[in-house]
Interface confidence: low
């Protein structure tokens, strides 16, 4: 029987619902449908339709309430600037097609802030930032008119306000009203006008979510307030005592759908993993909800700061858990969060007011029962004493992020719930949660975690040195002999670990150049410390021209490094930092770390190489299991080692071996890679296990890395577990906490 004929009460026929130039998919077991158009097109006049109780689909109505007979996919346009103050833009057009560009310039006496050139993107949004022409005459700077919005108010004195509006049919995201505050900042966040077809791309979300959560502050801790003249950026700080509560609130109602629920869970697992990788332990609260909320993890539970345990609880939640009561009562869910925040008998725990609260709500924004959830956000603000004291408003202590999921998102609702902070975005509308796992990268303010080892800023906007912040470039200038290039790794504020063979006994400190963080300037060197057992000529009499056993050196710098996002240390084995990085118990021994990092098998690792002035990660396998012997035996193919009778003469227990074609074809190191770290990447952290020493085959002749290399092209690295007593002795004042 055709589905349309044998339909249950309140279900609708699919006859005539097609869309010209696109397709549709059913949602909520046939109670709604979503029109899907190719990239660069949007469904006109509506994106979704609901099945009415009469058995007919909701009417196709335009924004000005005209009825349309058939849906169609239309080309996406970007809105035109309704107004542009104190300047001109060109070209002028009623609308702009994807890839069109506009340019802004200011009248004399006005300076342009934001983007001078903007491009219409495939999602109907303009690239770049709002262009603003400002003459600096106001107490606050001109807040601008985001394209598509209209602004009322052109006085920017202290406590003056401006309001923003959208054209009919568009929804305002951000702050409708902004007030000029002490310190010269505007309250709230920049508005924008959203059409129903607009989604945030994963990249946009990643960038905005990330930058909001990683905003930094200069100087004052929020608890102690700050003077009115000091304009602040915010930060979310996780200090090691774990003074942050993160509440994960997940909509499990009918309207969300099982696949989005699963996707949201994946994102949150990723988020927990990312936060944990920072070596800090926020407490988690975990709530799912439909008609009623269900608290899976309370922040007061002993294990709520155990990331692995919280992840396990999250993974065990089923979409079906709310099946019988499948309304959407967001208010009740937030009340569950409120109950976790509040303390019994009004007696707060020590440090209550240094605890930062982050609510991450994933919903379709369609609350259909229980009342307006915004009232609970107000209660939470009241409880945390936020916005009560003009001098110390404590706004930093609460962040509400709302991820609207799926085509039925009610933009007004999700915007109302989200925090509004200057230059930050807390509300996101996403098509599919599965796309969003890359969103949950860096969670916290760097300033508190800069000293954490093996941390990287893995965002797409990051430079090479954001991604490899430990990497050091070493150059030795030898008069009349050219120069030698090596790599090294920052291991503490004063030391860079590298290979001893990069230097000769004749090299003077002033002829050794070290640079870090991609900076042009060279660092002054105090001394180079060689491993006492290193002697390249140690086996010359035995016919071994070069002997690389104990090929490690530490460069001590004259001045302390200033850690930042592009300069920070790598983790060393058998230190407390590595214990924390691997999320092992504090009682972990050096042997247990070794078993974790170098088990008797093929171990996935990486090294960093410079190719065409770019740093790239190369994935290799350390042969530490059944392939170890054959890997080491290939050393006989190295120039000068062909006469060696017993390969253990040159491949001592100090070496780790990589390269070859099994289990995968490993890339090889080049001469300039020597001294660089061999790294194991675990739990989002980077731990150095070796120092690149020597290779069997020079695969980089003529400055080009050969694509085809023989199977015996192996590389040998000094195993740091084998030189720990020396490292421990030389780095004893560096606070690394050797085990």
């Amino acid at each position: 029987t055709p589905w349309s004929l044998a339909r249950p009460q309140g279900s609708c026929s699919l006859e005539g619902v097609e869309i010209k130039g696109g397709s549709f998919r059913l949602l909520q077991e046939g109670q709604a449908l979503e029109y899907v158009c190719p990239s660069g097109f949007y469904p006109y006049p509506v994106q979704t339709r609901t099945c009415r109780s009469t058995g007919s689909w909701s009417t196709l109505k335009t924004q000005d309430q005209k009825t349309v007979r058939k849906a169609e996919c239309r080309a996406i346009h970007c809105p035109r600037p309704h107004d542009f103050e104190n300047g001109e833009y060109w070209p002028r057009s009623p609308y702009y097609n994807v890839s069109d560009e506009i340019s802004f310039h200011c009248y004399d006496g006005y300076t342009l802030r934001g983007s001078a050139n903007r491009t219409c993107q495939v999602n109907g949004r303009w690239s770049g930032q709002t262009a603003i022409c400002d003459n600096g005459a106001g107490y606050c700077s001109n807040p601008g008119i985001p394209i598509g919005t209209r602004k009322v108010g052109s006085q920017y004195r202290l406590e003056d306000s401006v309001t923003y509006h959208c054209s009919r049919g568009l929804t305002l995201r951000g702050s409708q009203r902004r007030t000029c505050q002490e310190g010269g900042s505007w309250s709230g966040t920049e508005p924008s006008c959203q059409d129903s077809f607009m989604y945030d791309t994963p990249q946009e979300v990643a960038e905005a979510f990330l930058s909001s959560l990683t905003e930094t502050i200069e100087g004052v801790d929020a608890e102690d307030g700050h003077g009115p003249g000091e304009q602040q950026k915010r930060k979310i700080v996780l200090d090691p005592s774990g003074s942050m509560n993160i509440y994960l609130v997940l909509d499990g109602s009918d309207s969300i759908g099982a696949s989005n629920f699963t996707g949201a869970k994946k994102c949150l697992v990723n988020l927990i993993e990312k936060v944990a990788s920072y070596g800090v332990k926020p407490r988690y609260g975990l709530v799912t909800y439909a008609t009623y909320p269900k608290i899976w993890v309370k922040v007061s539970e002993a294990d709520s700061s155990n990331a692995d345990w919280v992840t396990k609880q999250l993974n065990e939640i089923n979409y079906e858990d709310h099946k019988l009561k499948s309304g959407t009562n967001t208010k009740k869910a937030l009340q569950a969060v409120y109950s976790m925040m509040s303390w019994p008998d009004d007696v707060p725990p020590e440090g209550w007011n240094r605890t930062r609260h982050v609510i991450i709500l994933m919903t379709d924004g369609l609350h259909n029962m229980g009342g307006d959830p915004i009232t609970v956000i107000d209660e939470i603000r009241d409880l945390l004493y936020i916005g009560k004291d003009r001098k110390n408003p404590r706004e930093d202590y609460l962040d509400v992020y709302v991820f609207g999921v799926g085509p039925l998102v009610n933009q007004v609702n999700i915007n109302a719930l989200a925090s509004k902070k200057d230059n930050e975005q807390h509300v996101f509308k996403v098509k599919d949660m599965e796309n969003l796992e890359d969103v949950f990268y860096q969670m916290i303010d760097e300033s508190q975690s800069l000293s954490l080892c093996g941390m990287v800023w893995e965002h797409r906007k990051g430079t090479d040195y954001h991604k490899q912040p430990w990497q050091a470039k070493i150059s030795v200038i030898r008069p009349s002999k050219g120069h030698e290039s090596c790599m090294g790794a920052v291991v503490s504020e004063y030391f860079v670990l590298t290979a001893a063979h990069c230097f000769t006994v004749d090299d003077k400190e002033h002829s050794i150049k070290v640079s870090v963080g991609g900076e042009k300037r060279d660092l002054e060197i105090e001394v180079v410390l060689f491993h006492p057992n290193y002697n390249i000529n140690g086996k010359k009499e035995a016919g071994i021209p070069e002997f690389y056993d104990y090929d490690v050196a530490l460069i001590k710098l004259k001045n302390k490094l200033k850690y930042g996002q592009t300069i920070r240390p790598i983790c060393l084995p058998c230190t407390e930092g590595t214990t924390r990085a691997l999320r092992l118990p504090p009682t972990t021994t050096c042997q247990q770390q070794k078993e974790e990092l170098l088990p008797a098998q093929d171990i996935k690792a990486l090294f960093v190489s410079e190719e065409e002035k770019k740093l790239t990660r190369k994935e290799v396998y350390i042969k530490n299991g059944d392939k170890k012997g054959s890997c080491e035996r290939d050393a006989q193919y190295a120039p000068g080692y062909d006469k060696v009778k017993d390969i253990s003469e040159v491949v001592t227990p100090r070496f780790l071996c990589t390269g070859g074609v099994s289990p995968y074809a490993d890339p090889n190191t080049c001469r300039g890679d020597s001294g660089g770290p061999l790294i194991v990447h675990k739990r989002s952290r980077f731990i150095q296990v070796g120092v690149i020493s020597w290779g069997v085959v020079d695969v980089c002749k003529n400055q080009k890395r050969q694509k085809q290399v023989p199977a015996h092209a192996r590389d040998f690295h000094i195993n740091l577990f084998q030189v720990l007593p020396w490292l421990k002795e030389k780095l004893q004042d560096e606070d690394l906490g050797f085990l």
């Epitope: 102690d224 307030g225 707060p348 440090g351 004493y385 009560k388």
Partner: antibody, heavy 121, light 107 residues
Framework: QVQLQQSGAELAKPGASVRMSCKAS????????IHWVKQRPGQGLEWIGY????????DYNQKFKDKATLTADKSSSTVYMQLSSLTSEDSAVYYC??????????????WGQGTSVTVSS | DVQITQSPSYLAASPGETITINCRAS??????LAWYQDKPGKTNKLLIY???TLQSGIPSRFSGSGSGTDFTLTISSLEPEDFAMYYC?????????FGGGTKLEIK
């Protein structure tokens, strides 16, 4: 037990300054804010401001911003209030009181006995 | 600033009676209202905070109620030592403000 011991009565001339003290004992000094309250003869109570002894951060009632200066000495667990440019309007009893732990909206749970200031030429 | 109006300003009662004192805020202060007792020769005593929470060590005949803008202090079966000056104070928003006080005297 918690005690706030205030310094003795002050007699001052108009235009002069006075500095009174409030010595805390019986609890961790740096964990609680100290508030100051004014009471003129036969009148009600007025909140002057508070200081966080741990950080020295303070906030004042706008009305007393140019009148009172609050400081704290952690080593002696003592908070000081200086009143400047005295006039007859400043003749009053001044109380120090302990606020909630680290500034929670808890009321003032322990009070000093008060310091009487008389401004007269 | 939040204005606090306290009534009555004067009240006469006998031991054993129950009395109430009211305070009204000029805008909502949630539940954050405190009540104090002021007796000559003694330091001021906190009785109630957060509208209805009894400070430790205070007898249970003292109770507070209310939220938003209207609050009440009730003293049931008055004891001789209860005759004193009583003040309410909002501790919701700086600057903190006090009611004008109620003098409770023996009838």
């Amino acid at each position: 037990q918690v005690q706030l011991q205030q310094s003795g009565a002050e007699l001052a001339k108009p235009g002069a300054s006075v500095r009174m003290s409030c010595k805390a004992s019986g609890y961790t000094f740096t964990n609680y804010w100290i508030h100051w309250v004014k009471q003129r003869p036969g009148q009600g109570l007025e909140w002057i401001g508070y200081i966080n002894p741990n950080t020295g951060y303070n906030d004042y009632n706008q009305k007393f911003k140019d009148k009172a200066t609050l400081t704290a000495d952690k080593s002696s667990s003592t908070v000081y209030m200086q009143l400047s440019s005295l006039t007859s309007e400043d003749s009053a009893v001044y109380y120090c009181a302990r606020g909630g732990q680290l500034g929670l909206r808890r009321a003032m749970d322990y009070w000093g006995q008060g310091t009487s200031v008389t401004v007269s030429s | 600033d939040v204005q606090i109006t306290q009534s009555p300003s004067y009240l006469a009662a006998s031991p054993g009676e129950t009395i109430t004192i009211n305070c009204r805020a000029s805008k909502s202060i949630s539940k954050y209202l405190a009540w104090y007792q002021d007796k000559p020769g003694k330091t001021n005593k906190l009785l109630i905070y957060s509208g209805s929470t009894l400070q430790s060590g205070i007898p249970s005949r003292f109770s507070g109620s209310g939220s938003g803008t209207d609050f009440t202090l009730t003293i049931s079966s008055l004891e001789p030592e209860d005759f004193a000056m009583y003040y309410c104070q909002q501790h919701d928003e700086y600057p903190w403000t006090f009611g004008g006080g109620t003098k409770l005297e023996i009838k």
